[in-house]
Interface confidence: low
């Protein structure tokens, strides 16, 4: 059951999925200039049985016609549902998170893919926040959203993070204040967008460390 | 099952000092930001007070601020208000919360009076 | 700080009416965006989080929705026990704000 919605937006934060559960979809996006093959996909599909899980389909990406290069590729009908998007992440995964059973790794990337990411999530999946660069989390550790079904509708539970600016102590979350925003757009904009390199050093990083862990017994 | 319990609240007078407790069980207090926020009677509600999970950083409404004081004893799971040169404004139902900015869940609140 | 205004102040509506209760901010909240029901002597009880998401064990005939500086929540069907003040709240900016309140009485 694909997940009606986004995952919940927090302020000077970021999302990833650690592992993908069966069923997700990843839209097969390409870059300017580029459009998917006519006879290619439309998305990748974690799909798999009991001992071992793997992206089905492939995309592929092939050069616009001239006239073409500057537009945007048009998305097909079926892909119109918006979702949350994350920044291309490389395939390095955490061993004990990607080899849960029943979830696909971050698939590799694909020749002239898109930037960002787009993934349509199903019933069951985890994604995990953190702060972006610049801020610090209120709360320990890393907090995570999970879709869940209740009544027949899907939901996403709220993660419990708030994130403050680290070199003004009298900066709250959310609160503006004058930085720099990747490609000159305001902060909210790019809340969700997750940079590998940072992304994969905080992980590492929270990896090794105790507060590394956290507890859904709230939720 | 998420429980938060306030106490301390009373009747004082302008100028005098009252220290409002809150006592968390049943998630990891530690783990977590908490708030006070505060209702004047017939009135709507105001985020008074912010403390990260570590008490490291610490936030306040300017109707407070330099009089109140917000702190956490992680080892005893309790929050605590420590509230100076109260004026007849700050009388209101104090609720102690967690969730962060999302007020998750609250305790039943305890009444501070300030009168002469 | 930003200045949540809610509409109406007060509102009479029977069992079964459908209700919009508007929120109004005097700045764009990015959709960090709460709604709270408060019955008399007791705490506020959140329902809607981020806008439009619904609070584990809330009905689903409440729902919210808006962006920018105008939101919205709903509900579709009054049921006796909606009978209650509502308000909305902002958490893009500390300090984080309320707006007065929705009284919702029995017509």
């Known amino acids: 059951e694909l997940c009606d919605d986004d995952p919940p937006e927090i302020p000077h934060a970021t999302f990833k999925a650690m592992a993908y559960k069966e069923g997700t979809m990843l839209n097969c996006e390409c870059k300017r200039g580029f459009r998917r093959i006519k006879s290619g996909s439309l998305y990748m599909l974690c799909t798999g049985n009991s001992s071992h899980s793997s992206w089905d389909n492939q995309c592929q990406c092939t050069s616009s016609a001239t006239r073409n290069t500057t537009k945007q590729v048009t998305p097909q009908p079926e892909e119109q549902k918006e979702r949350k998007t994350t920044e291309m992440q490389s395939p390095m995964q955490p061993v004990d998170q990607a080899s849960l059973p029943g979830h696909c790794r971050e698939p590799p990337p694909w020749e002239n893919e898109a930037t960002e990411r787009i993934y349509h999530f199903v019933v069951g999946q985890m994604v995990y926040y953190q702060c972006v660069q610049g801020y610090r989390a209120l709360h320990r550790g890393p907090a995570e959203s999970v879709c869940k079904m209740t009544h027949g509708k899907t939901r996403w539970t709220q993660p419990q993070l708030i994130c403050t600016g680290e070199m003004e102590t009298s900066q709250f979350p959310g609160e503006e204040k004058p930085q720099a925003s990747p490609e000159g757009r305001p902060e909210s904009e790019t809340s969700c967008l997750v940079t590998t390199t940072d992304f994969q050093i905080q992980t590492e990083m929270a990896a090794t460390m105790e507060t590394s862990i956290f507890t859904t017994e709230y939720q | 099952q998420v429980q938060l319990v306030e106490s301390g609240g009373g009747v004082v007078q302008p100028g005098r000092s009252l220290r409002l407790s809150c006592a968390a069980s049943?998630?990891?207090?530690?783990?977590?930001?908490m708030a006070w926020v505060r209702q004047a009677p017939g009135k709507g509600l105001e985020w008074v007070a912010y403390i990260s999970y570590d008490g490291d950083n610490t936030y306040y409404a300017d109707s407070v601020k330099g009089r109140f004081t917000i702190s956490r004893d992680n080892s005893k799971n309790t929050l605590y208000l420590q509230m100076n040169s109260l004026r007849a404004e700050d009388t209101a139902v104090y609720y102690c919360?967690?969730?962060?900015?999302?007020?998750?869940?609250w305790g039943q609140g305890t009444l501070v009076t300030v009168s002469s | 700080d930003i200045q949540m205004t809610q509409s109406p102040s007060s509102l009479s509506a029977s069992v079964g009416d459908r209700v919009t209760i508007t929120c109004r901010a005097s700045?764009?909240?990015?959709?960090?965006l709460n709604w709270y029901q408060q019955k008399p002597g007791k705490a506020p009880r959140r329902l809607i989080y981020g806008t439009n998401s619904l609070q584990s064990g809330v009905p689903s005939r409440f729902s919210g929705s808006g962006s920018g500086t105008d939101y919205t929540l709903t509900i579709s069907s009054l049921q006796p026990e909606d009978f209650a003040t509502y308000y909305c709240q902002q958490y893009t900016s500390w300090p984080w704000t309320f707006g007065q309140g929705t009284k919702l009485e029995i017509k």
């Open positions: 049943g998630f990891t207090f530690s783990s977590h930001a």
């Open positions: 700045q764009n909240v990015n959709k960090f």
């Open positions: 919360t967690t969730g962060g900015n999302s007020g998750y869940d």
